[in-house]
């Protein structure tokens, strides 16, 4: 991954923090809940983008070259944005305009654009959809996706908080 200009860490921090809040507002649990436990098997590993040790999102990795970590976060945001755009969230029960879900979608797009290098090619994924016999799965799928997104955003927000605290270049006063 080539070294390129750093993002606006402070703005990313603010947006990611807001996203965390929106993700919880969009799907607050009925009872006490810990963030998703991740069962590590090949199927789940390949299906969902996760921020892992080798992604360079630790303090030293961010200091050496933050682009590795930012690329992983970009991939994750694209993955979840794609799911939020799909039939899973478009069908019944319909989502109201300006609902927490709509705000989440807008903010996810905002953070993606902030991190998206101009020349970055758009990844094309097949849109998931539900057959008529699978309609009962929609609320269960929505819940799974939002729980997973909450876990992803919690880590991304910590990355941006660290970046904002340690990697933001100080303003040099002009004479």
């Amino acid at each position: 991954v080539p070294r390129s200009s750093s993002p606006d860490w402070a703005q990313c921090q603010q947006l990611s923090r807001n996203l965390c809040m929106l993700a919880w507002n969009a799907h607050a649990p009925a009872g006490h809940m810990n963030l998703l436990r991740e069962e590590e098997d090949e199927e789940t590993k390949n299906n969902v983008p996760r921020i892992q040790c080798e992604d360079g999102c630790d303090p030293q990795g961010l200091k050496d070259n933050s682009q590795f970590c930012l690329q992983r976060i970009r991939q994750g945001l694209a993955f979840y944005k794609h799911l939020l755009d799909s039939d899973i969230f478009k069908g019944e029960p319909a989502l109201l305009p300006d609902s927490p879900m709509e705000q989440l979608h807008t903010s996810l797009l905002g953070l993606s654009q902030l991190l998206q290098p101009e020349d970055h090619p758009r990844e094309t994924q097949q849109m998931p959809s539900l057959s008529s016999s699978q309609q009962w799965q929609r609320p269960l799928l929505r819940s799974k996706i939002l729980r997973s997104l909450q876990a992803f955003l919690a880590i991304a927000a910590r990355v941006f908080a660290h970046g904002a605290a340690t990697l933001t270049e100080p303003l040099v006063p002009t004479a």
């Epitope: 649990p29 009925a30 199927e43 789940t44 998931p128 799928l141 819940s143």
Partner: nanobody
């Protein structure tokens, strides 16, 4: 893998109640959803209700909303289906099932042997 054993089925009059239980054993720490499905003679198996193992979010088929309640007892590794105002059309074999994947699909891969519920008019 998760093993499931259902109990509580039986014969009941229309308007009556039953409570089904499903005890889970094995890899219960990996459970995401526990759900109830049913299959009436000559019909497809259909979704009835589900609950998240952590958090306790509940989901119901429209046909049972307001009449059936799904709940769980994590300490006992058991999920319950309280069925009230039963109708003859609720007659079916009721199956307990588990989705133990955190991936982005709903996959009830482990199933119990089923318990018969018969509602007479």
């Amino acid at each position: 893998e998760v093993q499931l054993v259902e109990s509580g089925g039986g014969l009941v009059q229309a308007g009556g109640s039953l409570r089904l239980s499903c005890a889970a054993s094995g890899r219960t720490f990996s459970i995401y959803y526990m759900g109830w499905f049913r299959q009436a003679p000559g019909k497809e198996r259909e979704f009835v209700a589900a609950i998240t193992w952590i958090g306790g979010d509940t989901y119901y088929a429209d046909s049972v909303k307001g009449r059936f309640t799904i709940s769980r007892d994590n300490a006992k590794n058991t999920v319950y289906l309280q069925m009230n105002s039963l109708k003859p059309e609720d007659t079916a074999v009721y199956y307990c099932a588990v989705d133990d994947r955190t991936n982005m699909s709903v996959d009830f891969g482990s199933w119990g042997q089923g318990t018969q519920v018969t509602v007479s008019s």
